[in-house]
Amino acid sequence: RRDVAHGILNEAYRKVLDQLSAGKHLQSLVARGVGGSLGGGAGDDAEPLSKRHSDGIFTDSYSRYRKQMAVKKYLAAVLGKRYKQRVKNKGRR
């Protein structure tokens, strides 16, 4: 049973480490300004980020990622004529 308990603890610990690692990666992305300036948004020259800002980091990084993906699809369609990549979610709004 002790082995099982250790296994469970190790798995939980690994998950925490993964989350911390992901958080650090996102911090580095934000610090380096990955996602660019398209669409404006908050400045990229912010001070090192605290736990208090973690929700904001994830939201901001995801928002930047979405913008980047959207503009990539747009460029593929309008400058690359790759119409299969066109956004066609007409019914959404």
Partner: antibody, heavy 112, light 109 residues
Framework: EVQLVESGGGLVQPGGSLRLSCAAS????????MTWVRQAPGKGLEWIGF???????YYASWAKGRFTISRDNSKNTVYLQMNSLRAEDTAVYFC??????WGQGTLVTVSS | DIVLTQSPSTLSASVGDRVTITCQSS???????LAWFQQKPGKAPKFLIY???KLESGVPSRFSGSGSGTEFTLTISSLQPDDFATYYC??????????FGGGTKVEIK
């Protein structure tokens, strides 16, 4: 005939607002990216931003905050709302379906 | 952000001449998504070439594009009277969307 027609341009005072329209005839705009581009008198082309089929808009960093692109699929029309206008916003404003079909442009003059 | 620099800014040529316009990018153009447009005074731009070298439907075959990365060219193999206009390159920039070059005016010599 397939065409885009911009309207809504004119003379506006600095600090004022204007809404430009881009109406399509002979084509359903709903599944296309729609782009706004402007051209100051005697100058080159400047990309403003685009709106996708779902209604999400993306802008050049200089345009974010003052300019808003929207669309009304039921009217087959796209809009460019411009606020806090400045003299340097004086230009011909073009809308384009993707970037291969363009309207004739509408002139916006910002002057007191 | 990408800056596209076209050269020359003005080009004087005669009917029948072979004309080459260069578009240089400050950094690699995303996906090689570079297009060329033709614009005449008081008119909207006309789409000529996409993805650096692919001819838009209906555009005469005397127009051709080449290049990749940061160096692109538009060539008109034999200039026709209808070709006197201003030409713009436009490149994909995932930070800023689309960047336009400053334009090249092709005028009659």
């Amino acid at each position: 005939e397939v065409q885009l027609v911009e309207s809504g341009g004119g003379l506006v005072q600095p600090g004022g607002s204007l809404r430009l329209s881009c109406a399509a005839s002979g084509i359903d705009l709903n599944s296309y990216y729609m782009t706004w581009v402007r051209q100051a008198p005697g100058k080159g082309l400047e990309w403003i931003g685009f709106i996708d089929a779902g209604g999400d808009a993306y802008y050049a960093s200089w345009a974010k905050g003052r300019f808003t692109i929207s669309r009304d699929n039921s009217k087959n029309t796209v809009y460019l709302q411009m606020n806090s206008l400045r003299a340097e916003d004086t230009a011909v404003y073009f809308c384009a379906r993707d970037l291969d079909l363009w309207g004739q442009g509408t002139l916006v003059t910002v002057s007191s | 952000d990408i800056v596209l620099t076209q050269s020359p800014s003005t080009l004087s040529a005669s009917v029948g001449d072979r004309v080459t316009i260069t578009c240089q990018s400050s950094e690699s153009v995303y996906g090689n998504y570079l297009a060329w447009f033709q614009q005449k005074p008081g008119k909207a731009p006309k789409f000529l070439i996409y993805e650096a070298s692919k001819l838009e439907s209906g555009v005469p075959s005397r127009f051709s594009g080449s290049g990749s990365g940061t160096e692109f060219t538009l060539t008109i193999s034999s200039l026709q009277p209808d070709d006197f206009a201003t030409y713009y390159c436009a490149g994909g920039d995932i930070s800023e969307g689309v960047a336009f070059g400053g334009g090249t005016k092709v005028e009659i010599k």
